[in-house]
């Protein structure tokens, strides 16, 4: 049975201050370690308890990290991405893509599905338009009676 999972995709700038044990998260991905099919991006695999990221609360497991201190993470080897974080300094600015699931359906491992999804407005706008047209038609019909 093939289901479809739709996502609301949002971006956010997250500024973290490195704590005593660092930034407090793990990553997967890179050109040599694709985690999502046809996407060599860097994803948050683990948020460490009581770490800087966990205490801040905005970064989530599954988020895609687009840049670190303005440096793009596209087309990087996994270890190069790790090194970039480790050398990022005390104040670290992350550009992050959140993906919120808005419709349940069968889904496998993140790496096995289509990561793109559909932004929710793509679904809501046509539904809203159809509703308005139907309401207008109904009102016209009533006026003719």
């Amino acid at each position: 049975m093939n289901g479809r999972v739709d996502y609301l995709v949002t971006e956010e700038e997250i500024n973290l201050t490195r704590g005593p044990s660092g930034l407090g998260f793990n990553i997967v991905g890179g050109t040599d370690q694709q985690y999502v099919s046809n996407d060599s991006g860097i994803y948050v695999s683990r948020i460490k308890e009581n770490g800087a990221a966990a205490l801040d609360g905005r970064l989530q497991e599954g988020d895609k990290i687009l840049s670190v201190n303005g440096q793009d993470l596209k087309n990087l080897l996994h270890q190069d991405a790790v090194d970039l974080f480790r050398n990022a300094g005390y104040a670290v600015s992350l550009r992050v893509q959140h993906r919120l699931q808005v419709q349940n359906g069968p889904i496998g491992h993140r790496g096995e599905g289509d990561p793109s999804g559909i932004p929710i407005f793509m679904v809501l706008v046509p539904v809203f338009a159809l509703t308005m047209v139907a309401a207008w038609a109904f009102m016209r019909y009533r006026q003719q009676l």
Epitope: I27, V28, R46, V82
Partner: nanobody
Amino acid sequence: HVQLVESGGGLVQPGGSLRLSCAASGFTLDYYAIGWFRQAPGKEREGVSCISSSDGSTYYADSVKGRFTISRDNAKNTVYLQMNSLKPEDTAVYYCAADFGSSVDSTCLNNQQYDYWGQGTQVTVS
């Protein structure tokens, strides 16, 4: 359900060898860093060796460099620790641990980064 099971420990004479195995179930090793740690009576748990989640880079504590070798077999979902030229000071309970992805903060020899631990296997060199 993530589970790690160590085996291969035992009693060995100084200069002898042992091969420890860490069998993983409930997940595949592909995206996991795996570490071997040990704890001797009355001492803190220390990192022995680990293998990264990405390119299979290996790391060793200074005390075991040149004597211990870590390797992974993704097909068997198992990580091995080959221990040669064993010394009495290698006596400890040996644990394997797994962590999803790579920590952006520290190398895989840092035991605080690991989420999943096995029950341990006793190694005695005497």
